[in-house]
């Protein structure tokens, strides 16, 4: 069951998945004056058995200009190498060794695909959230919504953060840090 | 655990260049907040520069900004240093860290909420 909204947005914070459950969908989108192959899915499906999950579909962008081209522009691995833009990298960033059965990692990136990555995410996803440049954290552990079916529609559950600038005094000074398990998932994770 | 071990450091002069590398083993490097530090000796050791694990936050002490780069490269476990226009005063050992709450929603400068550590490596500038 697909969620039917974004998950919530937090100023000054932005969101990224450790590990997307089956059934995710992530547009092939193209950067301005591309367009995605005549044959080319619209999509990237998580797909996946008991043992095993991955990303059913390629996406493939094409020169707008270039008409009845069928050249493959998924790039060689030599190629994605040099071609570690910081945008590239921010995509990248969770996609290490992180394996969650029924879970993709993050899709490496393709050539001339957007700057941005559209996911349409299924119920039980969680999200993670930081805070971004010259921001900190008044909730200072993990921060997290999970797409959870209620009453038959499904609502992603509150972030219990908020992000202020630097200079600002934190609300909570004597705050205690949770202390997470190091090498085990966030509980989140391992619950389902 | 993880574990960090740091390279790249060593003599250069006045105005010159290093790029110290962090390589880290365990697992799930990329929900850690990564961190560089720096000791005098004499001195405490200080923040440098740090990255989330969203890519989304690289604060810089003040003493660095606009000369040292931190990045990270997620597919090698490995956390670099890019340092330019160094100066007598980036003399020190440097340190990389990792720290211990994953998936945190900021990322800190206070060397206590780092839990992994490296050995560290020798900078030395001359002028």
């Known amino acids: 069951e697909l969620c039917d909204d974004d998950p919530p947005k937090i100023t000054h914070a932005t969101f990224k998945a450790v590990a997307y459950k089956e059934g995710t969908m992530l547009n092939c989108e193209c950067k301005r004056g591309f367009r995605r192959i005549k044959s080319g899915s619209p999509y990237m499906l998580c797909t996946g058995n008991s043992s095993h999950s991955s990303w059913d579909n390629q996406c493939q962008c094409t020169s707008s200009a270039a008409r009845n081209t069928t050249k493959q522009v998924t790039p060689q691995p030599e190629e994605q190498k040099e071609r570690k833009t910081t945008e590239m990298q921010s995509q990248m960033q969770l996609a290490d060794q992180v394996s969650l059965p029924g879970h993709c990692r993050e899709p490496p990136p393709w050539e001339n695909e957007a700057t941005e990555r559209i996911y349409h995410f299924v119920v039980g996803q969680t999200v993670y959230y930081q805070c971004v440049q010259g921001y900190r954290a008044l909730h200072r552990g993990p921060a997290e919504s999970v797409c959870k079916m209620t009453h038959g529609k499904t609502r992603w559950t509150q972030p219990q953060l908020i992000c202020t600038g630097e200079t600002e005094p934190s609300q909570f000074p004597g705050e205690e840090e949770p202390q997470a398990s190091p090498d085990g998932l966030p509980e989140s994770e391992t619950s389902r | 655990e993880v574990q960090l071990v740091e390279s790249g450091g060593g003599l250069v002069q006045a105005g010159g260049s290093l790029r110290l590398s962090c390589a880290a083993s365990g697992r799930a490097f990329s929900m850690y907040n990564m961190g560089w530090f720096r000791q005098a000796p004499g001195k405490e050791r200080e923040f440098v520069a740090a990255t989330g694990w969203s890519g989304a936050n690289t604060p810089y002490a003040d003493s660095v900004k606009g000369r040292f780069t931190i990045s990270r490269d997620n597919t090698q476990n490995t956390v670099y240093l890019q340092m330019n226009s160094l100066k007598p005063e980036d003399t020190a050992t440097y340190y990389c860290?990792?720290?211990?709450?994953?998936?945190?929603?900021?990322?800190?400068?206070?060397?206590?909420?780092?839990?992994?550590w490296g050995q560290g490596t020798q900078v030395t500038v001359s002028s």
């Open positions: 860290a990792a720290d211990s709450i994953r998936l945190r929603s900021d990322v800190t400068r206070i060397p206590l909420e780092y839990d992994y």
